[in-house]
């Protein structure tokens, strides 16, 4: 092909050309071409016009490029390009002009290219830029040259990893002359010991990040006195995992902070074992947004009723044991993957609407009822990956639930009592894998709205799957997959009309039966795939509904043999709707074995006598 | 309206076993909060005893671990207080109550006093 | 266990004054703090929830203050109504525990 030995991914558009050892611009790709990928090739330097065949670029990615110069406008021409990758290309000169002509830049990624400062860096006429990334670079100081003054459209400065130890009332000079309210900013990794007081006094940012910046508690205590005046819309503070400096926390490690206007608040990857932390985090008392991150803490109950959080996120933290929470403001509580407390205590959280306890391994004594979670409020409740939850109340008080998943929990008493009676908001269910054994036609009552049931890998009594879902009048989306099942009842799915998707995989079903699937005029993937299909269960083979589009039988177990012949062929007729057709085949006789059912030709005489 | 009511003997020997029902009208016991039992003394301050999850659950003052057992029934909708081997100083006047999900008691029986004395 | 002390035992005040009771923790409980009225032959009320938030149908002269370990119960402007036992109890931890109670007679 003309454009080999680069890799076509999308005709005319998309091309990689990754480590290909090129020394120059390759001049076989279409001019057409929008997403270039040339990193990993030694072209060293880039003249004037190097693009010049590519006017319509969007993306070009030029990582690794042993690029050492880069000549005055090297990328002209370059005027629809939105993203300009340099990541570890070990430049050394470039010229003032080098990015003249990149009219629709919005992302330029410097990372690794030994910038030692941003004084230099001839950008200030990229007016359209949103993005610059600078991180792993030798920046000395935070000083932000005056063309940032042009940047106006900038939303995100990545100066991480870099040599910034020192930050000065004169290094933000320039946004006080033109506010850039919606910078992110991104000082991780810096070496800092000393931010002048006032350097951020009446500074607004969208997002500002100092993670692993502080050798100790000291530095940081003082350095977070230094951001006193700035408002800052997230905060994102801590460490890394791989990166840890700072010992223990103490009660006054966070005072700084009350100094600041702070909308949202995150700390990552520190050790907290106060026994007191309401000081901690006094200072933060009235941001919507607080989240902790991989921090061992001793205690949260020491967080304030009155605290007004609208948002808690507590993911990957260690506890001594599951905390006592009782907000008055919380919105939304995410409590996902931590390690400690084994056993679910009810939270009070009046304002609730949103939980998500999911993958932490719990027990829950009861669910669910709104004394579990003081409040009547909720909406969308995860409980996933947890250990057994006794369902011993039926959503008293949380009528209100539009989303709940217990999907990989040990689900107890589930076929006593129509457990979901009262849910009738309830638009999405995923029950899947929870050892749920259906013994109860009653068990779904009351989804009277349900859209999505997701229920694979549970097990139905005698294998046979009863009339369950005469409430699901809403049903789109079933999967009944890993259930073990070997037969349907004929009216299983009767009222099912606005059913679009029905996963029954990985059954046990031997034959395939059309009648079921009548009253579904809806209906448009049918999934029997990994089955042990044989055959058909009746003579007389029904047509699918005319809205189904997509039937897959693959992996099952075809009898490929005379007294088939009429389920084979009705297989052929149904050819246009047929999912992956060539992985459908012959099983048996051992002769017809691994052999496309579609290609058979069997014909078949009856015999004389 | 949740309303809760406590009845049983008044008067108990000592080394036998207090038995105390509690009578919840106005909302299923076995479908929400936990249901508690609180004393107190003749003039004096209020100690908790012990509760019964609505999932049946039971967990207890560990100065009375040994003595007490919390049980209900559902159909019934009330639930028992049991506490063996009284002696004198159990007698009090006995509450069951209603914590909601914070750990405060917004509604309370009226109290039954039980003299232990022979 | 988490130990709750009360003071005074015994208040005597005269009506339409002011009266401040308060409530020691032995340890940190943030704001897990209640409090109950308690009238003779009477179960206990509950008043203020989380050290200051008046239950609905109390009247506005209670409020509460207080968190860690030093809470305050004032009743702004005593009434006759208001004589009674007023207990604090703690719901940071299990077992839950009460104050010893501080008695409010009127003169």
């Known amino acids: 092909e003309s454009w080999e030995p680069c890799v076509e991914v999308v005709p005319n558009i998309t091309y990689q050309c990754m480590e290909l050892k090129f020394y120059k611009i390759p001049d076989n790709i279409p001019f057409s071409t929008k997403n270039l990928d040339l990193s990993f090739n030694p072209l060293r330097h880039l003249g004037s016009y190097s693009f010049l065949r590519f006017p319509e670029l969007q993306v070009l990615d030029l990582s690794r490029c042993e690029i050492q110069t880069i000549e005055d406008g090297a990328y002209q021409s370059l005027s629809h390009l939105s993203t300009l990758i340099l990541t570890g290309n070990p430049i050394q000169s470039l010229a003032l002009g080098a990015f003249s002509g990149l009219s629709s830049l919005q992302k330029l990624v410097a990372v690794e290219t030994n910038l030692a400062s941003l004084e230099n860096f001839p950008i200030g006429h990229l007016k359209t830029l949103k993005e610059l990334n600078v991180a792993h670079n030798l920046i000395q100081s935070f000083k932000l040259p005056e063309y940032f003054s042009n940047l106006t459209n900038l939303e995100h400065l990545d100066l991480s990893s870099n040599k910034i130890q020192n930050i000065y009332c004169k290094d933000l000079q320039v946004l006080h002359q033109m506010p850039l309210s919606n910078l992110s900013l991104d000082l991780s990794l810096n070496p800092i010991n000393f931010i002048q007081p006032g350097a951020f006094k009446e500074i607004r940012l969208h997002k500002l990040t100092l993670r692993s910046n502080f050798d100790d508690l000291n530095v940081m205590k003082t350095c977070i006195q230094g951001l006193a005046g700035l408002e800052v819309h997230r905060l994102v503070l801590g460490e890394f995992r791989n990166e840890r400096n700072l010992e223990e926390f103490d009660k006054s490690s966070l005072e700084g902070l009350c100094n600041l206007t702070i909308e949202e608040f995150r700390l990552t990857y520190l050790d907290c074992y106060l026994d007191n932390i309401i000081d901690l985090f006094n200072c933060l008392a009235n941001v919507s947004s607080f989240s902790l991150v991989s921090v061992n803490i001793k205690r949260v109950e020491d967080f304030s009723y009155n605290f007004r959080w609208q948002h808690l996120e507590l993911v990957n933290c260690k506890f001594e044991q599951f905390p006592t929470l009782e907000l008055k403001s919380l919105k939304r509580l995410t409590f996902t993957a931590n390690k400690g407390g084994n056993a679910f205590s009810e939270v009070d959280l009046p304002s609730l609407e949103f939980l998500d306890l999911s993958r932490n391994g719990l027990s829950f004594k009861g669910c669910c009822s709104q004394s579990d979670f003081g409040t009547t409020s909720l909406k969308y409740l995860d409980l996933s990956f947890n250990d057994v939850i006794t369902m011993s109340s039926n959503f008293l008080g949380l009528e209100q639930l539009e989303h709940l998943d217990f999907q990989h929990s040990n689900l107890k008493q589930m076929s006593q009592f129509s457990v979901f009676l009262s849910l009738r908001n309830l638009i999405y269910l995923d029950i899947s894998h929870t050892h749920t054994r259906v013994a109860f036609n009653g068990i779904f009552d009351g989804l009277l709205s349900l859209k999505v049931l997701k229920m694979a890998g549970n097990s139905f009594q005698e294998n046979f799957l009863p009339d369950i879902f005469t409430d699901l009048k809403n049903l789109t989306f079933l999967d009944l997959s890993q259930c073990q099942l070997e037969q349907l009842s004929p009216t299983a799915f009767d009222t099912l009309n606005k059913l679009q998707v029905l996963n029954m995989s990985h059954n046990n079903f031997f034959s395939l039966d059309t009648f079921p699937y009548k009253c579904l005029p809806s209906l448009q993937v049918l999934d029997y795939s990994l089955n042990h299909i044989m055959t058909s269960n009746n003579q007389e083979l029904q047509h699918f509904p005319s809205s189904l589009a997509f039937l897959n039988l693959t992996q099952n177990d075809f009898a490929c043999t005379c007294e088939h012949q009429s389920f084979l062929q009705w297989i052929k007729d149904q050819r246009q709707l047929l999912v992956e057709a060539e992985r459908m085949e012959c099983a048996t006789p051992s002769d017809k074995q691994g052999m496309p059912v579609l290609s058979l030709n069997i014909t078949c005489q009856m015999n004389k006598t | 309206q949740v309303q809760l009511q406590e009845s049983g003997p008044g008067l108990v020997k000592p080394s036998d076993t207090l038995s105390l029902t509690c009578a919840v009208s106005?909302?299923?016991?076995?479908?929400?909060?936990?249901w508690h039992w609180i004393r107190q003394p003749p003039g004096k301050g209020l100690e908790w005893m012990g509760y019964i999850h609505y999932s049946g659950y039971t967990d207890f003052n560990p100065s009375l671990k040994t003595r007490i057992t919390i049980s209900r029934d559902t159909s019934k909708n009330q639930f028992s207080l049991k506490l063996s081997s009284v002696t004198a100083v159990d007698t009090a006047v006995y509450y069951c109550?209603?914590?909601?999900?914070?750990?405060?008691?917004?509604?309370w029986g009226q109290g039954t006093l039980v003299t232990v004395s022979s | 266990e988490i130990v709750l002390t009360q003071s005074p035992d015994f208040q005597s005040v005269t009506p339409k004054e002011k009266v401040t009771i308060t409530c020691r923790a032995s340890q940190s409980i943030s704001d897990h703090l209640h409090w109950y009225q308690q009238k003779p032959d009477q179960s206990p009320k509950l008043l203020i929830k989380?050290?200051?938030h008046a239950i609905s149908g109390v009247p506005s002269r209670f409020s509460g203050s207080g968190s860690g370990t030093d809470f305050t119960l004032t009743i702004n402007s005593l009434e006759a109504e208001d004589a009674a036992t007023y207990y604090c109890q703690q719901g940071h931890s299990f077992p839950l525990t009460f104050g010893g109670g501080t008695k409010v007679e009127i003169k």
């Open positions: 989380y050290a200051s």
């Open positions: 106005g909302f299923p016991i076995g479908q929400g909060y936990s």
């Open positions: 109550a209603r914590k909601d999900s914070g750990n405060y008691f917004p509604y």
